[in-house]
């Protein structure tokens, strides 16, 4: 069998949801000594980076300016050390937002409920879309989908204090082109004192784990680079729609 290098890790810096005309940054974390990185889009080569000097850093950032629906979709990356290519990374779904219109998000019976009550979110958008998405801030990888002509409902079932937080919804024109976000709706779930004090606190920043962890090489890193890279690939779980 043909020998290949370990697959790189692809990440979106800050967020995979990029407002139209803004810049997306995708990181491909490969290996020290890589002479070329390739970014692939929907299975075709999109862009090439050749680090200078190659041996000093374990990855590259691909900046995608002027985000639009033609640049939204599934990305992956590969890298090369000498003549040896890596396996392909996992797929990353890059979404363009702020397309067309703004939906309205509401919650029933209301934004303040007690633990155990059944809660339903409603997302409404009058323009032509059939898929709606509900995201909890700080948890934007956990996208809930629902379908409807102008409105979709998101039944949450009996809620707990873990459901507390700020929610937004989007209308989706296809898997990778979303509307402007709705205004946030803050859900407050009151429960008994023990539950409340133990409730997890959401981070206030989105996708805090999606930062580009590119490092410059040191002697120790050089020795551990391959082992470390393999370990990261093993533990990294990536988002798929």
């Amino acid at each position: 069998p043909k020998q290949t290098l370990p697959k790189p890790i692809i990440r979106a810096e800050s967020t995979y949801m990029v407002p139209k005309e803004k810049q997306a940054t995708l990181c491909c974390q490969g290996s020290y000594g890589a002479v070329e990185y390739q970014l692939h889009f929907e299975g075709s080569l999109f862009a090439v980076e050749r680090p200078k000097p190659p041996e000093r850093i374990n990855g590259v950032k691909f900046h995608i300016p002027d985000m639009n629906s033609r640049k939204a979709g599934r990305y992956s990356c590969i890298y090369r050390v000498g003549e040896l290519w890596s396996e392909r990374s996992d797929l990353l779904d890059l979404v363009v937002t702020e397309m067309y219109d703004t939906p309205t998000l509401s919650v029933h019976p209301g934004p303040e409920v007690t633990s155990g009550e059944k809660v339903t979110f409603y997302c409404r958008l009058d323009t032509a879309t059939s898929m709606f998405l509900l995201l909890k801030e700080g948890r934007s990888r956990d996208v809930q989908r629902s379908y409807g002509k102008v409105q979709a409902e998101f039944p949450m079932g009996p809620v707990t204090t873990a459901h507390r937080g700020s929610y937004r919804c989007f209308g989706s024109y296809n898997n990778y082109a979303w509307s402007f976000p709705s205004e946030p709706v803050k859900l407050l779930v009151t429960g008994d004192i023990e539950n409340t004090s133990l409730a997890p606190t959401d981070p206030t920043f989105p996708d805090s784990w999606d930062t580009c962890l590119l490092t410059r090489e040191t002697g120790l890193q050089k020795d551990l680079a391959l082992w470390d890279h393999t370990a990261q690939n093993h533990h990294h779980h990536h988002h798929h729609h």
């Epitope: 810049q23 889009f41 075709s44 080569l45 999109f46 862009a47 950032k61």
Partner: nanobody
């Protein structure tokens, strides 16, 4: 806004050479990665060659590697495609494209990465 105008196309014999030029009007030419694509009748538009905004690196389709050379002169707002050892398979309309990049070492290969396109220049290779 960038306007692109290709020139230099024409009829050439197999084995001959041709140099295409693409003149850009508008500001900040040196911030744009540039590429050449071609489209033969009834076929899709194919990538030919690309160059980063700084001029290095460059990237070529396998079918033209070693025969074609892409270059740019930022002071003249112009990108060139030097075509050597042409063959009938190189017959097509050649398009120049410009795409903004945030790094001067990025080469853009996919057509969706380009925002601006020229009208094209016809290249015909006779055998």
């Amino acid at each position: 806004q960038v306007q692109l105008v290709e020139s230099g196309g024409g009829l050439v014999q197999a084995g001959g050479s041709l140099r295409l030029s693409c003149a850009a009007s508008g500001r900040s030419f040196s911030r744009y990665a540039m590429g050449w694509f071609r489209q033969a009748p009834g076929k899709e538009r194919d990538f030919v060659a690309a160059i980063s905004s700084s001029g290095d690196p460059t990237y070529y389709a396998d079918s033209v590697k070693g025969r074609f050379t892409i270059s740019r002169v930022n002071a003249k707002n112009t990108v060139y495609l030097q075509m050597n050892s042409v063959n009938p398979g190189d017959t097509a309309v050649y398009y120049c494209a410009a795409g903004l990049t945030a790094r001067d070492t990025t080469v853009v290969v996919h057509p969706n990465g380009y925002s601006y396109w020229g009208q094209g220049t016809q290249v015909t290779v006779s055998s």
